[in-house]
Amino acid sequence: ESALITQQDLAPQQRAAPQQKRSSPSEGLCPPGHHISEDGRDCISCKYGQDYSTHWNDLLFCLRCTRCDSGEVELSPCTTTRNTVCQCEEGTFREEDSPEMCRKCRTGCPRGMVKVGDCTPWSDIECVHKESGTKHSGEVPAVEETVTSSPGTPASPCSLSG
């Protein structure tokens, strides 16, 4: 008969164990990195690099790890307790309303506008009309020019589409 496992009892190395048994199925939850067995009596480890679970759960199956698309870089790999973190490659971005693919950032602003925000992995360059002023320094280029963007560095988790 297995001993009752509480959340406090689970050291990191135990969470990575292939199988965890619970003596109290009425509690009904398995720790991150595991899913529940069909009969609700056991906690079964997710497969490293293949699937994961992030919270205490009663899931029948672990969630599939995201695979970064072409045009993305993998910032951190999938573990049994955390999904892959993907980021758009330098010079591209992913919008919230179209998360399925990275799009190329514009290389500059249209005539009569100035750049006030750089290309980042989650946003295109930001342009404003000269007349309306700028959001940052307030400087306006003296001559008409196309301002090229520089890539940002912060990371963002990738979309769930694999």
Epitope: I36, Q50, N57, L59, F61, L63, R64, T66, L160, S161
Partner: nanobody
Framework: EVQLVESGGGLVQAGGSLRLSCAAS????????MGWFRQAPGKEREFVAA????????YYVDSVKGRFTISRDNAKNTVYLQMNSLKPEDTAVYYC?????????????????WGKGTLVTVSS
């Protein structure tokens, strides 16, 4: 976004067999766990069977164990429910569902998508 369309339902005599299919559109089909649910007239929707994204793990409700088999073909974006030794109490509309996973009680986890259902009638 995943669209699901069930087919294969019909009228069958008790003891007979049917194979339901659920065709999915969308390139992310293989990311999802798939489940079959059923709703008999005047009853609540019931969790019947499910399998994980790879097809390597399956779940069946006790009442269908040994009679029903769930499987998937990720290359064809299709999930199947092979139903043998059918009983009149299996009569219901059968629904296909896709989700990140399913809880032990059949609750979908994450975004979930549902088909419109296919009717299975088992006569005695």
């Amino acid at each position: 976004e995943v669209q699901l369309v069930e087919s294969g339902g019909g009228l069958v005599q008790a003891g007979g067999s049917l194979r339901l299919s659920c065709a999915a559109s969308g390139r992310t089909f293989s990311n999802y766990a798939m489940g079959w649910f059923r709703q008999a007239p005047g009853k609540e929707r019931e969790f019947v069977a499910a399998l994980n994204w790879s097809g390597g793990s399956t779940y069946y409700v006790d009442s269908v164990k040994g009679r029903f088999t769930i499987s998937r073909d990720n290359a064809k974006n299709t999930v199947y429910l092979q139903m043998n030794s059918l009983k009149p109490e299996d009569t219901a509309v059968y629904y296909c569902a896709a989700a990140g996973s399913f809880s032990l009680g059949g609750r979908p986890y994450g975004d979930d998508y549902w088909g419109k259902g296919t009717l299975v009638t088992v006569s005695s």
